[in-house]
Interface confidence: low
């Protein structure tokens, strides 16, 4: 006969980064024991194993160690799967296959979603605007999934559909950044609204911009930033300093402050119309509101990531305007190297051994140096590889091949060129024959 396996009909909707439960249940017969149970979760399309329970034991996750069963509930027929730290790539169908004496299976769909950020609005050109000018308004919203629907309307709520170009680009995590561009001819003034809708979450994020043609600026504001790059450790907060000299009688209502990425012109943070308009950069930026009136336009960037590295432009407009760019150099210290030996037992003088030095999660790429016990550099037969993880941090693996003497010490030094931080490890090989690591 067939075992009845039950799963929800509707897709399970899970936010990126959260945990999801894929429900699956069966009805155990009286006297059922877990020793009889074979439970397999697999990807429906590819049949790739995700998680299994067999021979009375949880066989563990075969899916990047992000899955778990509910062991205390299995005996009651609860075969549900917990999927941790959901990613876009997890989206799809999962099959729950239960076998006792009989067997049955059913498939449950996982729909991944991520909310879009509040849109940021930029204007091009953004000065010397007069009625009749054609302007380009860009509405940008970040890190959502799945692809968004974008709607424009004017101040009266009338939809604007002509001259709209929308592009959506997925990042390495599969999340979308949406950029929608509206081209309009200015009236005396006007309000333009952009709405970004997530079709799965039915979440709307909207922003608007009101354009009032302005008179031409007459001179330049001197904007000062540090000449040297600001060095920030991954995960810490960084201050990008920027200052200007306010004139007597200056009021914040006169100030337009924009921080943007120098290369892409992506808006990072803005202060306009006497108000902090907030972060357009993953909600990780802040100004120093109490210091703005004194001419301090610095930007605080929180939880620095490798991807933040680059140049940021501070743009200040009062009656006049000026701008300057500051560079952010991101860094992360390398871990103390771990050393491994191959082969690692029955070693004798004259044997060729491979010593591997591994150091993790540093940035930028490391410099690796080997030396012997006398401090003499070892450069021959060294192969070093560096691989970036999803956060852009590097794991470095350096392999040294040497012919053993009677004994010897081999040291590996991993240097972070930005932090001027050295991390080193060494291994001493003595005696014959020997085993590494030494047995207790």
């Amino acid at each position: 006969g067939a075992l009845e396996v039950q799963v929800p009909e509707d897709p399970v909707v899970a936010l990126v980064g959260t945990d999801a439960t894929l429900c699956c249940s069966f009805s155990p017969e009286p006297g059922f024991s877990l020793a009889q149970l074979n439970l397999i979760w697999q990807l429906t399309d590819t049949k790739q194993l995700v998680h299994s329970f067999a021979e009375g034991q949880d066989q563990g996750s075969a899916y990047a160690n992000r899955t778990a069963l509910f062991p205390d509930l299995l005996a009651q027929g609860n075969a549900s799967l917990r999927l941790q730290r959901v990613r876009v790539a997890d989206e799809g169908s999962f099959t729950c296959f239960v076998s006792i004496r009989d067997f049955g299976s059913a498939a449950v769909s996982l729909q991944v979603a991520a909310p879009y950020s509040k849109p940021s609005m930029t204007l091009e050109p953004n000065k010397d605007l007069r009625p009749g000018d054609t302007v380009t308004i860009t509405c940008s919203s970040y890190q959502g999934y799945p692809e968004a629907e974008v709607f424009w309307q004017d101040g009266q709520g009338v939809p604007l559909t002509g001259n709209v170009t929308t592009s959506q680009m997925a990042n390495e995590q599969g999340l979308f950044d949406v950029h929608s561009i509206l081209r309009v001819v200015l009236g005396a003034n006007g309000t333009y609204s952009c709405l970004v809708r997530n079709p799965v979450l039915q979440q709307d994020a909207h922003s608007s911009v009101t354009i009032t043609p302005q008179r031409s600026p007459t001179g330049a504001v001197e904007v000062q930033v540090p000449e040297d790059p600001v060095v920030a450790l991954v995960g810490t907060d960084a201050t990008l300093r920027c200052s200007f000299s306010p004139e007597p009688g200056f009021s914040l209502a006169q100030l337009n402050l924009i921080w943007q990425l120098t290369d892409t012109k992506q808006l990072v943070h803005s202060f306009t119309e006497g108000r902090d308009q907030g972060s357009a950069y993953a909600n990780r930026t802040a100004l120093f509101p109490d210091l703005l009136a004194q001419g301090n336009a610095s930007l605080r960037l929180q939880r620095v990531r490798v991807a933040d590295e680059g140049s940021f432009t501070c743009f200040v407009s009062i009656r006049d305007f000026g701008s300057a760019a500051v560079s952010l150099q991101v860094a992360a210290p390398y871990s103390k190297p771990s050393m491994t030996l191959e082969p690692n037992k029955d070693l004798r003088p004259g044997d060729t051994v491979t010593i591997t030095c591994s150091s993790y999660r540093g940035y930028p790429e490391a410099e690796v140096f080997w030396q012997d016990g006398q401090g003499v550099p070892l450069t021959g037969n060294v192969t070093t590889s560096q691989m970036a993880n999803e956060q852009g941090l590097f794991d470095v693996h350096s392999v040294l091949r040497v012919v053993l003497g009677a004994n010897g010490t081999y040291s590996c030094l991993v240097r972070n060129p930005v932090l001027q931080q050295d991390a080193h490890g060494s291994v001493t090989i003595t005696g014959q024959p020997m085993t590494f690591p030494p047995e207790a």
Epitope: K47, L49, A62, A170
Partner: antibody
């Protein structure tokens, strides 16, 4: 029936550019990941670049900054724009479909390939 | 990147014999390994994925095994059409997706 047909190969000089096309039929190109895989004469297979169903692009280190993968959903075609070509880029270039939306997977369908020769 | 090493480079056998092809990964790739067959002048053809699962239309004489770093493709009772080059490919750690150097199975 799923089919992939590559075109655009030919003989070029070092430093020149070439664009390869891969016309797909039997499936929607933005519902699956598709990659370019190359094979130098008498050598093994080397993955070059991939684009996922959602549009994420990846490149091998050997071509990063020189090659650009793209697709046109309206005509179900994949492209590989190859700039600054080198002699070591000489190979048969295959278009290969992954059997799911994310590109990091095995390839269940392959085209017949198109030969690119870079020679002075 | 994950390096895949295939051995032997060439395997010389007679029809009806069993072929055992090895693929070793430089670090664990769990079961994210596929095998392909390629004949001269043709594109590769998928044989096995997820280490053990035969692709559609692949005869039962082809089987895969292994996990972690050691993988094997076995062809029981070689047929004349099985003489070709075989490649393994990992899709666990990426980018890049990587292939082994290939094993040529030729007729004795």
């Amino acid at each position: 029936d799923v089919q992939l047909v590559e075109s655009g190969g030919g003989v070029v000089r070092p430093g020149e550019s070439l664009t390869l096309s891969c016309a797909a039929s039997g499936f929607t190109i933005n519902s699956y990941a598709v990659s370019w895989v190359r094979q130098a004469p008498g050598e093994g297979l080397e993955w070059v670049s991939g684009i996922s169903g959602s549009g994420v692009r990846y490149y091998a280190d050997s071509v990063k900054g020189r090659f650009t993968i793209s697709r046109d959903n309206s005509n179900n075609t994949l492209y590989l724009q190859m700039n600054s070509l080198r002699a070591e880029d000489t190979a048969v270039y295959y278009c290969a479909r992954s059997n799911k939306v994310t590109w990091n997977n095995f390839f269940d369908y392959w085209g017949l390939g198109t030969l690119v020769t870079v020679s002075s | 990147e994950v390096v895949l090493t295939q051995s032997p480079g060439t395997l010389t056998l007679s029809p009806g014999e069993r072929a055992t092809l090895s693929c070793r990964a430089s670090r664990s790739i769990l079961t994210s390994l596929a095998w392909y067959q390629q004949k001269p002048g043709q594109a590769p053809r998928l044989l096995i994925y997820n280490t053990v699962t035969r692709a559609t239309g692949i005869p039962a004489r082809f089987s895969g095994s292994g996990s972690g770093t050691e993988f094997t493709l076995t062809i029981n009772s070689l047929q004349s059409e099985d003489f070709a080059v075989y490649y393994c490919q990992q899709y666990y750690d990426w980018p890049p997706l990587t292939f082994g150097g290939g094993t040529k199975v030729e007729i004795k």
